[in-house]
Interface confidence: low
């Protein structure tokens, strides 16, 4: 940026170099150039000369005034027109920033994804600040009263090995930037209650010919947690509304869930699980598509990942990978 230039004078900003977006600000330039009584002082913003709201204060100083400054960043510098100098002489420059103080962090959430070895804490940071904002995550054991602090710019992964103060903790987040500091409420957690089981994945689907054809969804998880509750949601891709089935699950074997679906319709399925009775769910799994056969079955030709159907005695869809997970709700 502009901070490394050799100055022949001084440039400063009131109320500050970093200020609240939308404020009125004044930028002052004071020349200190040998053998120069400046005829004129000029201001440049991002390389473009400003023409308005410039006031000469005295022989060596001028002020540039901005009303309702809304740019997150700008490089300012000023120059002097010196007698006997053909070109303007650079006086000094400064990078300025505008933004907002942080909002109070809320929705502080800490989870341990099974097998990750980390406790992941996230929060809603609120509105965009536009300026450098840091977060300090405080983790205080309710058993030993020991407190640890972690500095981050977004979320934080804390190794579970470093959580030596028992099972119960208070977690809170401080947000700070040049314009202010805010602190979240305290979240009380128990490490055993925030574990999210290893991701559940739908591996394949098949529709079996019968008096009433039925579709079987095969799904599994590598979790070692014994008591797991899961939800599978499904809908025709043309619908807005999901249907949800609930399961109490033991993942010692691949799960098979039966659905009686309309023929010749493309459906989408997702699954998610939680440790039974606990607070946090997995995000919904990748979208899994399956099209049911027409009512009069024909011979199966082939099966294909995610978005395939074939009429026949058995119609199968096989998952070989993950699409982007949709954990916000409906898809079109």
């Amino acid at each position: 940026g502009i901070t490394n230039i050799n100055c022949s004078g001084h440039i400063w900003v009131e109320p500050a170099t970093i200020f609240k977006m939308g404020m009125n600000i004044s930028i002052y330039c004071q020349a200190a150039i040998k053998n120069c009584q400046p005829r004129k002082l000029h201001f440049y913003k991002n390389g473009i000369k400003e023409r308005f709201q410039i006031t000469r204060i005295n022989k060596t100083t001028a002020r540039l005034w901005y009303k309702n400054f809304l740019e997150p960043h700008a490089s300012m510098y000023c120059t002097a027109e010196c007698p006997k100098h053909f070109q303007e002489t650079l006086i000094c420059g400064k990078d300025i920033s505008s933004g907002y103080p942080p909002d109070i962090p809320d929705e502080v959430t800490c989870v341990i994804y099974e097998y990750s070895g980390n406790m992941t804490c996230t929060w809603n940071a609120g509105k965009l600040t536009y300026i450098d904002t840091k977060y300090v995550v405080h983790v205080k054991s309710l058993e030993t009263e020991e407190e640890q602090q972690y500095l981050t710019s977004s979320y934080i992964n804390i190794s579970t090995d470093s959580l030596q103060g028992g099972k119960k903790y208070l977690v809170w987040v401080q947000a700070a930037n040049a314009l202010g500091m805010e602190e979240s409420k305290q979240l009380q957690i128990h490490l055993d209650d925030i574990v999210i089981p290893s991701a559940a994945v739908i591996s394949r689907a098949e529709t079996i010919n019968a008096t009433v054809p039925k579709t079987i969804i095969y799904w599994d998880s590598q979790t070692t947690i014994e008591k797991v509750s899961c939800e599978m949601r499904y809908k025709a891709t043309t619908n807005q509304t999901w249907n949800v089935k609930e399961f109490d699950t033991n993942f010692t074997y691949v799960q098979q869930s039966e659905f009686y679906l309309e023929p010749n319709i493309k459906y989408v399925f997702q699954v998610r699980c939680q440790e039974t009775g606990k607070r946090y769910w997995q995000p919904w799994s990748s979208l899994f598509f399956h099209k049911t056969p027409e009512t009069v079955p024909q011979v199966t030709s082939k099966a294909f990942q995610h978005d395939t159907w074939n009429s026949g005695l058995t119609v199968a869809s096989i998952s070989t990978g993950h699409l982007t997970s949709d954990n916000r709700g409906d898809i079109g």
Epitope: L142, K168, L170, Q174, M181, E182, E183, K185, Q186, L187, Q188, H190, D193, R279
Partner: antibody, heavy 121, light 112 residues
Framework: EVQLQQSGAELVKPGASVKISCKAS????????MNWVKQSHGKSLEWIGN????????SYNQEFKGKATLTVDKSSSTAYMLLNSLTSEDSAVYYC??????????????WGQGTTLTVSS | DIVLTQTAPSVPVTPGESVSISCRSS???????????LYWFLQRPGQSPQLLIY???NLASGVPDRFSGSGSGTAFTLRISRVEAEDVGVYYC?????????FGSGTRLEIK
């Protein structure tokens, strides 16, 4: 209307245990911490501890660890305090009082009517 | 533990006059978030305590604005202007900056 209805007065013998209840109504029980406070006759108030009904997490004043055990029954929106190995020192009025889920909002905004415990042989 | 000291066991007051009740803390109750975690309660004879003031200066719901709280990090005052007969009872300060929450010994307000 928020109400905390406590169980009636108790007269118990030294060495025995007693379980005091506090039934909450008029708000979502699991959204607020429940505090318990002791007031000995003619004396000030002492905070015993609190319980987070959502998780069942408890925090105790060290003075009451081993003396008081706090539990909840979410289905009936009731908080309980079990006091064991009772002595005459435990004779007091015990209050339940609602507090925010988090330590830095309004605490103790609603109180039960109190349960009088008398320990005597 | 944080100790709260209420030096005056009782204060006599004439109805209609103002009165101040003081409370001192052994540790600053000013949190880094700018809040001061001191509460005031009134316990009328034969009743449960009632919240009057939270976070040093905030008036609890339903409490008359004759009551006000002020203070620094360690010295606090509850002021009652135009005292009424129904204001009699014991006034307690309480900190909930840190566990264990602690109460002052109480100051009894008596009508002359």
């Amino acid at each position: 209307e928020v109400q905390l209805q406590q169980s009636g007065a108790e007269l118990v013998k030294p060495g025995a245990s007693v379980k005091i209840s506090c039934k909450a109504s008029g708000y979502s029980f699991t959204d607020y911490i429940m505090n318990w406070v002791k007031q000995s006759h003619g004396k000030s108030l002492e905070w015993i501890g609190n319980i987070n009904p959502y998780f069942g997490f408890t925090s105790y004043n060290q003075e009451f660890k081993g003396k008081a055990t706090l539990t909840v029954d979410k289905s009936s929106s009731t908080a309980y305090m079990l006091l064991n190995s009772l002595t005459s020192e435990d004779s007091a009025v015990y209050y339940c009082s609602r507090g925010s889920y988090y330590g830095y909002e309004t605490f103790f905004d609603y109180w039960g009517q109190g349960t009088t415990l008398t320990v005597s042989s | 533990d944080i100790v709260l000291t209420q030096t005056a066991p009782s204060v006599p007051v004439t109805p209609g006059e103002s009165v101040s009740i003081s409370c001192r803390s052994s540790k600053s109750l000013l949190h880094s978030n700018g809040n001061t975690y001191l509460y005031w309660f009134l316990q009328r004879p034969g009743q449960s305590p009632q919240l009057l003031i939270y976070r040093m200066s905030n008036l609890a719901s339903g409490v008359p604005d004759r009551f006000s709280g002020s203070g620094s990090g360690t010295a606090f005052t509850l002021r009652i202007s135009r005292v009424e007969a129904e204001d009699v009872g014991v006034y307690y300060c309480m900190q909930h900056l840190e566990y264990p929450y602690t109460f002052g010994s109480g100051t009894r307000l008596e009508i002359k």
